[in-house]
């Protein structure tokens, strides 16, 4: 039975050319996290964090994605095209699959605020 909940950084904004941290947190379950996938709005995988194999950054994102902190992901050298939805998918046992959503808005403005509040989607 899936009892857990995913908390995410929710809707965030960041400056073009800057960087942003995408964070998800799985709570309210004792399930083992075997893998976390990070995906972009068009279903392309950015990175995988496997409990045994560690991090795998997909080639298309190698230059702009850094693993961590923790199970999170850091996006660097942001462009306007990075605006959109990002999903963290927690593969766990015995529960199964948990998914969290983050919406990132990349702003031209130099006064872009980076909100880091956690919320349950």
């Amino acid at each position: 039975m899936m009892t857990g909940t995913i908390e995410t950084t929710g809707n965030i904004s960041a400056k073009k050319g800057g960087s942003v941290i995408l964070q998800c947190h799985l709570s309210s379950t004792m399930a083992q996290v075997t893998q976390v996938n990070w995906e972009q709005h068009d279903h392309s995988l950015l990175a995988i964090r496997n409990a045994e194999l560690g991090w795998h950054i997909y080639p298309a994102f190698k230059d702009r994605v850094a693993p961590g902190p923790g199970l999170g992901l850091t996006l660097q050298s942001l462009t306007m095209n990075d605006t959109g939805e990002y999903f963290c998918t927690y593969h766990t046992y015995p529960d199964g699959t948990y998914r969290g959503r983050i919406f990132l808005e990349v702003l031209e403005s130099s006064v872009a605020e980076h909100s880091a509040r956690f919320q349950i989607p």
Epitope: N37, L45, E52, L53, Y93, T97
Partner: antibody
């Protein structure tokens, strides 16, 4: 080319044991989680075991927990399923399958090996 | 466990036609449903995963849709090689479970 070749099936009496093998080739075996799925004579598919890439994590449905053991030898590119206390309802074709790297479903399957439990 | 009900169990169609196969889960499985093709003498083939994502190398005439409890596999402009048995499988929670299969035959 990804290839999975199962072996070790056969006829066994109720209460008996059997060890199935799956030889993998054409991919880096040690970086993929693997599963065993069986198909009953009535053609129903049932997932029976899964193991993580390094062998640390193993998972089973309640129907086989305590009777089946899944293991792997990454040096030999081989997956195993050890079955004990076999019952007539375990009669099936057993397939090994590779899980996608992102864990979404099973992307390659073997041809299967037949297991018959009968007295 | 999540029960998967697949329908129809049997379907007859002609090459060039468009067909749909349905799977219904006993509870929400988000988007996490896969579709497989089984043909005699061949290994099972993954067609669709995560509800609608086409597996690499699978022709675009195969498509998947749905989320929550109701899912559909659509094969448009049937080719002779598409006549086979199709299974759905939920990959949302353990234990992974399968539908009962749909045998697609030539009319």
């Amino acid at each position: 080319e990804v290839q999975l070749v199962e072996s070790g099936g056969g006829l066994v009496k109720p209460g008996g044991s059997l060890k199935l093998s799956c030889a993998a080739s054409g991919f880096t075996f040690s970086t993929y989680a693997m599963s065993w799925v069986r198909q009953s004579p009535e053609k129903r598919l049932e997932w029976v075991a899964e193991i993580s890439s390094g062998g640390t994590y193993t998972y089973f449905p309640d129907t086989v927990t305590g009777r089946f053991t899944i293991s792997r030898d990454n040096a030999k590119n081989t997956l195993y399923l050890e079955m004990s206390s076999l019952r007539s309802e375990d009669t099936a074709m057993y397939y090994c399958a590779r899980k996608r790297r992102d864990y979404y479903a099973m992307d390659y399957w073997g041809q299967g090996t037949s297991v018959t439990v009968s007295s | 466990d999540v029960q998967i009900t697949q329908s129809p169990s049997y379907l007859a169609a002609s090459p060039g036609e468009t067909i749909t196969i349905n799977c219904r889960a006993s509870k929400s499985i988000s988007k996490y449903l896969a579709w497989y093709q089984e043909k005699p003498g061949k290994t099972n083939k993954l067609l669709i995963y995560s509800g609608s994502t086409l597996q690499s190398g699978i022709p675009s005439r195969f498509s998947g849709s749905g989320s929550g409890t109701d899912f559909t596999l659509t094969i448009s402009s049937l080719e002779p090689e598409d006549f086979a048995v199709y299974y759905c499988q939920q990959h949302n929670e353990y234990p992974w479970t399968f539908g009962g299969g749909t045998k697609l035959e030539i009319k």
